[in-house]
């Protein structure tokens, strides 16, 4: 058996750290059998024999000039095999960072704090902590650990399904190389790192015969979990075209009616979503969506809600994109106190 | 008892090729450089070149870079040395030592190769 | 390349006496150098490996030196089969090269 022990990575490749003592390992040979090393492609002999280091090689303090492939033979001459030096750095503690677009499961990402330029990969798991005791600071021993299971592909990210909201866990991340390992310990609850997908499907509609009024709908973000437990709330955003400051509201629901909208220019409006109870972050805004206020004459007759709403309100199915949910509050209605003030604003 | 066997003398008209082949026995094959050199009548030797055990690289001497080839067949533990465009300066007596990376420990008993119009 | 010159081109001596034969190269080599001997109609042998270093069954009338760019043979005792022409290699560089060899013959 060779008595070179096999480090992670391919074959046949030996790794030292540059300005460090290196040694190489014959892997043809008998441990302490003498060797003789050579450059491959140079005749001359870097180590004979005779040197008293057996089967190894010592390059002292290695630079880059020193990476390659090197040949080792016997003491007839025979091939004891090639060895290629690469030179890196151990690893240093990744950096971590978790993230939540809904309150079932997480995710987190790594990247390395440090170029090692050796092979590299990483080992992730996690535990789940539990408290003891509303106000104790003890931790119960700790539950796992588990695997975190990696993207594939190579993709630096690990998921963990079937989270617990209220539950806090320690993330390990481990970046391994055939120097050495290092470990970056993070402990995550999914309540500080919740940021939800922002709202889907957003439109802008004007509302006839009103110039100053956009109505703007939307949905949960498809990445939300059915289950009513668990809401969103949102914030809106307008301007006017070429308008650089931005309007901002807090819808009660998943549409708002806007009423102050400059007539006859195109608006842009976004939306993003949070918790209700105000966990974690704001979403990311939602792509644009542009509409322009309604040009023509209003009705005679102010016709009731109903009538206004030309899609009558249907609760939407389990696996449609909004989930069922409690109103937080009453729909706006299309019409308020503000109308008369309108109306007489348009009839000027 | 490490034998290594090359073929027979061979006479060449200038611009033919001449292959010379050596068969080793008593060791194993892919352990070693084989090594091919060349002693022209009363002058001293010329390094050809030499080939790898067992991934069969070469290192060349540039002199014969562009008309040496040097093979090996793994499967009949025989080398071979083929020499292009010959001419009459490479009348000489042809070798394959086996040997280490540089050095060259057992030969062949050589291969007169006379190249005549 | 580098160059080897050997010397003297022949060496006439008596058996029993000590030869002395000497290799020099065209730069620098370290301790890449080593030697053969060559008797009429055969193939080489060798006999000294870098520089100093003796080869299993070869007497030890046989001993080298030297480093960088001069080296020297000696044959301590010469006997009757050591009568032959003997060549210096060196393996510091690509292409390996060999002296033009030194005769040694009986005087």
């Known amino acids: 058996s060779s008595p070179c022990p096999q480090a992670w990575g391919p074959p046949g490749v030996q790794y030292g750290q540059p300005g460090r003592s290196v040694k190489l390992c014959c892997p043809g040979v008998t441990a302490g059998d003498p060797v003789s090393w050579f450059r491959d492609g140079e005749p001359k002999l870097l180590q004979g024999p005779d040197s008293g280091l057996g089967h190894e090689l010592v390059l002292a303090q290695a630079d880059s000039t020193d990476e390659g492939t090197y040949i080792c033979q016997t003491l007839d001459g025979a091939l004891g095999g090639t060895v290629t030096l690469q030179l890196g750095y151990p690893p240093a503690r990744p950096v971590v960072s978790c993230q939540a677009a809904d309150y079932e499961n997480f995710s987190c990402t790594w990247s390395p704090s440090q170029i090692s330029g050796l092979p590299t990969r990483y080992l992730t798991s996690y535990r789940k902590k539990t408290v003891l005791g509303a106000d104790s600071q003890r931790r119960s021993p700790s539950t796992g650990p588990w695997p975190c299971p990696q993207d594939p592909l190579g993709a630096a990210r690990c998921v963990v399904h079937g989270a617990e909201f209220w539950s806090q866990y320690r993330i390990n991340v481990t970046e391994v190389n055939p120097l050495g390992a290092s470990t970056r310990l993070l402990d995550v609850s999914l309540q500080s790192i919740l940021r939800p997908d922002p709202p889907q499907g957003l439109r802008v509609e004007s509302v006839p015969g009103y110039p100053r009024r956009l109505r703007a709908s939307w949905t949960y973000p498809a990445s939300w979990p059915c289950q009513p437990h668990f809401l969103l709330k949102f914030r809106l955003q307008y301007r006017p075209a070429q308008h650089p400051a931005w309007s901002t509201v807090e819808p009660a629901g998943l549409e708002e009616v806007i009423t102050d909208a400059v007539a006859g220019l195109p608006h842009a409006v976004r939306v993003s979503a949070r918790d209700f109870l105000d966990a974690g972050t704001w979403s990311t805004w939602s792509p644009e969506a542009w509409g322009t206020p309604s040009t023509g004459t209003i009705p005679k007759e102010i016709p009731a809600w109903g009538q206004l709403h030309t899609q009558p309100e249907v609760e939407p199915q389990v696996d449609s994109p909004a989930p069922p949910r409690p109103s937080l509050q009453p729909h706006p209605r299309l019409l308020d106190h503000r109308d008369s003030v309108e109306q007489v604003a348009v009839l000027a | 008892q490490v034998q290594l066997v090359q073929s027979g003398a061979e006479v060449k008209k200038p611009g033919a090729s001449v292959k010379v082949s050596c068969k080793a026995s008593g060791y194993t094959f892919t352990n070693y450089w084989m090594h091919w050199l060349r002693q022209r009548p009363g002058q001293g030797l010329e390094w050809i070149g030499n080939i790898g055990p067992s991934d069969s690289k070469t290192h060349y001497n540039q002199k014969f870079k562009d008309r040496a080839t040097l093979t090996v067949d793994k499967s009949t533990s025989t080398a071979y040395m083929e020499l292009s465009s010959l001419r009459s300066e490479d009348t000489a007596v042809y070798y394959c030592?086996?040997?280490?990376?540089?050095?060259?420990?057992?030969w062949g008993q050589g291969t007169l190769v006379t190249v005549s119009s | 390349d580098i160059v080897l010159t050997q010397s003297p081109a022949t060496l006439s001596l008596s058996p029993g006496e000590r030869a002395t034969l000497s290799c020099r190269a065209s730069q620098s080599i370290s301790n890449n150098l080593h030697w053969y001997q060559q008797k009429s109609g055969q193939a080489p042998r060798l006999l000294i490996k870098?520089?100093?270093q003796s080869i299993s069954g070869i007497p030890a009338r046989f001993s080298g030196s030297g480093s960088g760019t001069d080296f020297t043979l000696t044959i301590s005792s010469l006997e009757t089969e050591d009568f032959a022409v003997y060549f210096c290699q060196q393996s510091y560089s690509w292409p390996l090269t060999f002296g033009q060899g030194t005769k040694l013959e009986i005087k």
């Open positions: 030592a086996r040997g280490d990376y540089v050095l060259f420990t057992y």
């Open positions: 870098y520089a100093s």
